[in-house]
Structures are given as C-alpha cells and as structure tokens.
C-alpha cells in the first residue's frame, strides 16, 4: 500500500462567546486538514479525533465518526470543529480576551489531530500537531493557513 | 515613560483647515489605540475617535464624521487629526490620548493643542 | 448617545472635608463581556484631564487612597475622604462602554 498523508492547514475560523459571572471563554474553533490518498483503490476515513490544549491543559475535544470516502490518488479537505472552553484556573484568560483596547487577543493553542483510515479490513492512524494563533477577543474568519503566521500580541502596560 | 507630545497653537481663518500631530514616545506606539478628544473654553470633554496606527483602523463620534479625519504614521510615532470646513465652533483645544491596555481607560494625555479660528 | 449626568456642577469644600460627587448614565454601562466602563479624571486649570480612577473603583497608579469609587449599572459615586489643596479642579466621569465614548459636564471642586 502506498502512503495515506494527512495535512493540517490550519484554523479556519474561531467564534469567541462569554460567560462573564463564572469567567469563561467558549471557542469555537474550526480547522482543516487534507487527506491524500496516494493509493489505487478508495480508503475511508473512519473516524477523526481532536484535541485542543491551552498551556498544557486540554480545554477541548472532538471526534468525528464515518466521516468520508477518498477515492482513488484522490484527495479531501475536511473542517472540523472543536468546541473549547477556558476556565477555572485559567479564568485569568477572561481578563485578557476581553480587553476592548486590545486589537487582537493572540493566544498559543495546541492542535491535535488524529485520522483513523481503513482500507480491505486494515486500520491506520495518523497523526499531527501544530501550535496555533487563535484570537479569543472576537470572531475570526482566517484566509488560509493565515493564523500559522500571526504574531502573539501580549498585554503592554 | 509614557510622553504625547502634541504640536502648538494655531490661529486659523473660516472655512481653511488644520492638521494636528501627536508624537508618542516611551511605549509600542503601533499597539495602542489614539483617541482624540474636544474641549471648548469653560465647556466639558467630547470624544471625537480614534485611531489604531497598527494597521490604521478607526472608530468615529457620528457627530464629527466629515468634520474630523484621524491618521497615524507607525515610522514617525505620531497621529493626527486633520480639521476642515473650521468655524467658530472648531475653536477648542484638543487632545490626544492614549487608551491603556490595563486599565482600558485614556491613561496618558497630551498637553492640548488651542485652535482658535477667526478671521 | 449615553448621557452622562454630573452632580453637583459646583462643590464648595473646607480641606479636610469629605467630598462626593455623583454621576448617573442614561443607560447601563455593564458591558457584555461583564465589565463596567466607568472612569473618572481630574483636570486642573491649564492642564489635560489626568486619569484617577477606572473601572468603577480602581484607583490609577500614584492616586492616593483617599480617592475612592463606588457604584454600579447606572448610578456611580467618587468621593475623596479628606479633600487636600492639590485636590482641586474639575472632576469628569466618563464611559466606554457604549460608542460614542461620552463625558460628564463636570463638577468644580473648589475650596469654601
């Protein structure tokens, strides 16, 4: 068999809502992977797990299952979306993502992701990882593979 | 430490315009958001807008749109505020003021600029 | 636009007393991210508006701590406990919550 690669683009959108009285911030974030199938028959893609950590603490997870089918020396862009949550000891964050006099709230998460194919009864994982730009202060639509390339803008006083 | 320092007095005829500047020094300039802000003699504060130099965004007071235009230079540290169509009501000092990130509050003012427009 | 009502306009003090003056919005100044963006400044003759307090309460680096702010919603307070020569101007509130930013009309603190 010929290799199955996996590619993570990037983010593709992050939408940022608030829970003021617990100090919680919930992010939506959408990423998009490729998945080439370098083979002569189809591969499924059974399932893709993903996970989101903020200073080494996971803040979110997601699993898709029976996601598609990729044909032939064929390739497919996949969004996924995981929903994250920032809060209780990292509730400092609050303070920060909703700075009104802050332009854009960079903050460093990590991307994982998983990708189970299957091909005639045999399963493969693949995985990835990648540090990301996301802004927690507002919702974000990047171009894309743009957030790779963002600067992380701390608070100045 | 944080310094505006704004240009000096301008004595301006009816209906001619001005062009006031505001260099900051001692902080990321381009990371701060510039407010401008109109006080008449013996009256109270009006905001006018802001400017963010970083990438040149604003935000307008309805009230001054077409009578204000805001713009930051990142290389020379400074923003202005150009004034057309001026009359007597134009006639105030003005100030620019930097919008903290802590305190997200103007924490740092600069000394003022007197217009006075007359013919 | 927010109106911003300051009360008194004049507020003729001994030094030592205690002053307070009042600020009242038109509509609540509670952000939705839950923060209240109610600032005061002191301005003295010839010279810009100096930030005192932000945020309600929070007194501004080097504001002595007999400056004080209270309130919350619509209706705010900041009084001085004992009111020093130095302390004398004209006090503003002010909001950012709500574009246009708007000010008070100001009160005078002047000595009786």
């Known amino acids: 068999p010929r290799s199955i690669e996996v590619k993570y683009i990037g983010v593709k959108s992050a939408y940022v809502s608030y829970d003021a009285e617990k100090r919680t911030i919930y992010l939506n974030i959408t990423n998009t992977l490729n998945i080439t199938n370098n083979n002569y028959y189809s591969v499924e893609v059974e399932n893709i797990t993903a996970q989101v950590q903020f200073s080494k603490t996971v803040i979110g997870k997601a699993r898709l299952n029976n996601i598609t089918n990729i044909g032939p020396l064929d390739m497919k862009q996949i969004d996924y979306t995981v929903p994250t949550v920032i809060a209780e000891e990292m509730s400092y964050m609050y303070d920060f993502c909703t700075l009104l006099s802050i332009k854009v709230h960079n903050i460093v998460l990590m991307m994982q992701v998983t990708v189970t194919t299957a091909y005639f009864g045999h399963s493969e994982q693949i995985s990835q990882e990648r540090y990301q730009y996301v802004d927690c202060g507002r919702n974000t639509t990047y171009q894309l593979a743009q957030s790779e390339y963002l600067n992380v803008l701390q608070p100045q006083q | 430490q944080v310094q505006l320092q704004q240009s000096g007095a301008e004595l301006v005829k009816p209906g001619a315009s001005v062009k006031i500047s505001c260099k900051g020094s001692?902080?990321?300039?381009?990371?701060?958001?510039m407010n401008w802000v109109k006080q008449r003699p013996g009256k109270g504060l009006e905001w006018i807008g802001q400017?963010?130099?970083?990438?040149?965004?604003?935000n307008y007071n309805g009230k001054f749109k077409g009578k204000a235009t805001l713009t930051a230079d990142k290389s020379s540290t400074t923003a202005y505020i150009h004034l057309s169509s001026l009359t007597s009501e134009d006639s105030a000092v003005y100030f620019c003021?930097?919008?903290?990130?802590?305190?997200?509050?103007?924490?740092?003012w600069g000394q003022g600029t007197s217009v006075t427009v007359s013919s | 636009d927010v109106v911003m009502t300051q009360t008194p306009l004049s507020l003729p003090v001994s030094l030592g007393d205690q002053a307070s003056i009042s600020c009242r919005s038109s509509q609540s100044l509670v952000h939705s991210n839950g923060k209240t963006y109610l600032h005061w400044y002191v301005q003295k003759p010839g010279q810009s508006p100096k930030l005192l307090i932000y945020k309600i309460s929070n007194r501004f680096s080097g504001v002595p701590d007999r400056f004080s702010g209270s309130g919350s919603g619509t209706d705010f307070t900041l009084k001085i406990s004992r009111v020093e020569a130095e302390d004398l101007g004209v006090y503003f509130c002010s909001q950012i919550t709500h574009v246009p930013w708007t000010f008070g009309g100001g009160t005078k603190l002047e000595s009786k």
């Open positions: 003021a930097r919008w903290g990130h802590y305190d997200e509050a103007m924490d740092d």
């Open positions: 001692g902080y990321a300039f381009s990371s701060y958001w």
């Open positions: 400017i963010y130099p970083g990438d040149g965004d604003t």
